[in-house]
């Protein structure tokens, strides 16, 4: 006569997080008397999931009526599955006794939980960098299962190839995390650029998740300076302009120096924006040349985004102009954005 067999027909079951998992188990006999118990894992540390005889298991329901006479189906449904539920589940027949003793176990069913990755978070360098420099961006996503996942990097729709990706942990786990670092070479046109991290996973049904970083948060485009002397507006007055071009971000402070002495300091406010996202600004200085006996060295000094100042100088020839006696100071005015304040 055949001894009782515990049959777990499914070697593995895969369930999406939040759904219910059905674990099948049938026995071939009602002999011996005693309960069926379900465990996660094997050995002394196994976790009791359900006991037909006693206990309260709020997430577990029996698929068929376990009290029904002649019932040999001890399949269970576990509700609201999370990645922490992953593991191998064993249906075990016990023999009535004091205490009950394990009689026979099923072969086990491995439950894998399909969990979606979290939205990728892309972060750039802590400090801004200038064009031609290589900067690193990181992308992280967590909590997904199974382990297989695909990560791609894009810059303005163009796929990047210089990146390194790790999925942790290396061994078996209830859920996994991905960490990727991409290297991006900055160009002067990158103010409007975006770096995109794209994650594809079986749970996303072909709709990858994306995380973005705007290079406007990362790039610093230093300005180019040009100092020019404008035609004379009136006798003894010369208009000198400082064109500050193609800079980003907007934070900029300009100082005029006459022969090395600070004449005027101002902060860029009303700027014009270029198509590539950089800014232009212009400041001007009205110099009363009659106040100067010798040539004047005018310097436009710009401090951009907290960086060391850059400057451009212009030598103003005054020898050709008649001197106005009794005056020893230069009367000057400044202007910006080419506005004439007279």
């Amino acid at each position: 006569e055949e001894e009782l067999q515990v049959i777990q027909p499914d070697k593995s079951v895969s369930v999406a997080a939040g759904e219910s998992a059905i674990l099948h188990c049938t026995v071939t006999s009602l002999i011996p008397v005693g309960p069926i118990q379900w465990f996660r894992g094997a050995g002394p540390a196994r976790e009791l999931i359900y006991n037909q005889k006693e206990g309260h298991f709020p997430r577990v329901t029996t698929v068929s009526e376990s009290t029904k006479r002649e019932n040999m189906d001890f399949s269970i449904s576990i509700s609201n599955i999370t990645p922490a539920d992953a593991g191998t589940y064993y249906c075990v027949k016990f023999r009535k006794g004091s205490p009950d003793t394990e009689f026979k176990s099923g072969a086990g069913t491995e439950l894998s939980v399909r969990a979606k990755p979290s939205a990728p978070v892309v972060s750039g360098p802590a400090a801004r960098a200038t064009p031609q420099h290589t900067v690193s961006f990181t992308c992280e996503s967590h909590g997904f299962s199974p382990r297989d996942i695909t990560l791609k990097w894009f810059k303005n729709g163009n796929e990047l190839s210089d990146f390194q990706t790790n999925v942790d942990p290396v061994g078996e786990s209830v859920s996994y995390s991905i960490h990727s670092t991409a290297k991006v070479v900055l160009t002067r046109e990158d103010v409007h650029s975006q770096v995109i991290c794209e994650v594809a996973h079986v749970t996303l049904q072909g709709d990858p998740l994306r995380g973005t970083a705007n290079l406007s948060e990362t790039i610093r485009v230093p300005p180019t300076l040009e100092v020019t002397q404008q035609p004379v507006r009136a006798e003894n007055q010369v208009n000198v302009t400082c064109q500050v071009r193609k800079f980003y971000p907007q934070r900029l402070q300009l100082t005029w120096l006459e022969n090395g002495n600070v004449s005027r300091t101002e902060t860029a406010s009303t700027v014009t924006e270029n198509k590539d996202g950089t800014y232009n600004w212009m400041s001007w200085l009205l110099v009363n040349v009659s106040a100067h006996r010798d040539d004047v060295k005018l310097t436009c000094q710009v401090e951009h985004d907290g960086q060391p100042a850059v400057s451009k100088s212009h030598d103003l020839k005054v020898s050709a102009h008649p001197k106005e006696q009794g005056s020893n100071t230069a009367a000057e005015n400044t202007g910006s954005n080419e506005r004439n304040i007279y």
Epitope: L30, I31, V33, R69, S98
Partner: antibody, heavy 115, light 111 residues
Framework: RQLVESGGGLVQPGGSLRLSCTAS????????ISWVRQAPGKGLEYIGT?????ITYFASWAKGRFTGSKTSSTAYMELSSLRSEDTAVYFC????????????WGQGTLVTVSS | DIEMTQSPSSVSASVGDRVTLTCQAS????????LAWYQQKPGQAPKLLIY???TLATGVPSRFSGSGSGTDFTLTISSLQPEDFATYYC???????????FGGGTKVEIK
């Protein structure tokens, strides 16, 4: 679906008897067969359950004197060293108790132990 | 071994009456629910009514119900019918396989 007992009768004290319980309409292979007796005018008394070869057990008072075996269609119980107080109607029933209760029952067979 | 005590040993009742029979175990039955009720009429084999303390057996009228857990159990016949006059036995199971013991029975007689 029924059980039919046979093998009862008159036996002398100290004698032996083999009772049979034959199933018709169902198999006994996945169920235990339990034996219960009832002395004249008395209540029911559980004797034991025959499962597979390994899984056969008897009430403490019946151990040693009563033994059992089973095929897919018939269960047997051997009664030995019989005494007058063993006189009773012997019933077999399918089931092993708890979630496999005794049902159905045979009609019973009378065993009389007397000299 | 477990011991099962039924009370009363007999009860007289009329058709339509609600009848309550009790069964007490000397210790908690196996799983707190290893308790069955059987009905026996003279010259017949017992018939299963209730198992696992409260589960109604197939084909048994719904006027029969079982309740209880641990050591104290009840069989209730909500409206006694003429065919219900019989002797009722409880069968309790202890923690060991062979520890199955019937109560002494309760005879339900016509008043």
């Amino acid at each position: 679906r029924q059980l039919v007992e046979s093998g009862g009768g008159l036996v002398q004290p100290g004698g032996s008897l083999r009772l049979s319980c034959t199933a018709s309409g169902f198999s006994l292979s996945s169920h235990g067969i339990s034996w219960v007796r009832q002395a004249p005018g008395k209540g029911l008394e559980y004797i034991g359950t025959i499962g597979t070869g390994v899984i056969t057990y008897f009430a403490s008072w019946a151990k040693g004197r009563f033994t059992g075996s089973k095929t897919s269609s018939t269960a047997y119980m051997e009664l030995s060293s019989l005494r007058s107080e063993d006189t009773a109607v012997y019933f077999c029933a399918r089931g092993s108790a708890w979630n496999d209760p005794f049902d159905p029952w045979g009609q019973g067979t009378l065993v009389t132990v007397s000299s | 071994d477990i011991e099962m005590t039924q009370s009363p040993s007999s009860v007289s009742a009329s058709v339509g009456d609600r009848v309550t029979l009790t069964c007490q175990a000397s210790q908690s039955v196996y799983g707190n629910n290893d308790l069955a009720w059987y009905q026996q009429k003279p010259g017949q084999a017992p018939k299963l009514l209730i198992y696992l303390a409260s589960t109604l057996a197939t084909g048994v009228p719904s006027r029969f119900s079982g309740s209880g857990s641990g050591t104290d159990f009840t069989l209730t016949i909500s409206s006694l019918q003429p065919e219900d006059f019989a002797t009722y036995y409880c069968l309790g199971g202890g923690d060991d396989e062979a520890d199955n013991v019937f109560g002494g029975g309760t005879k339900v007689e016509i008043k």
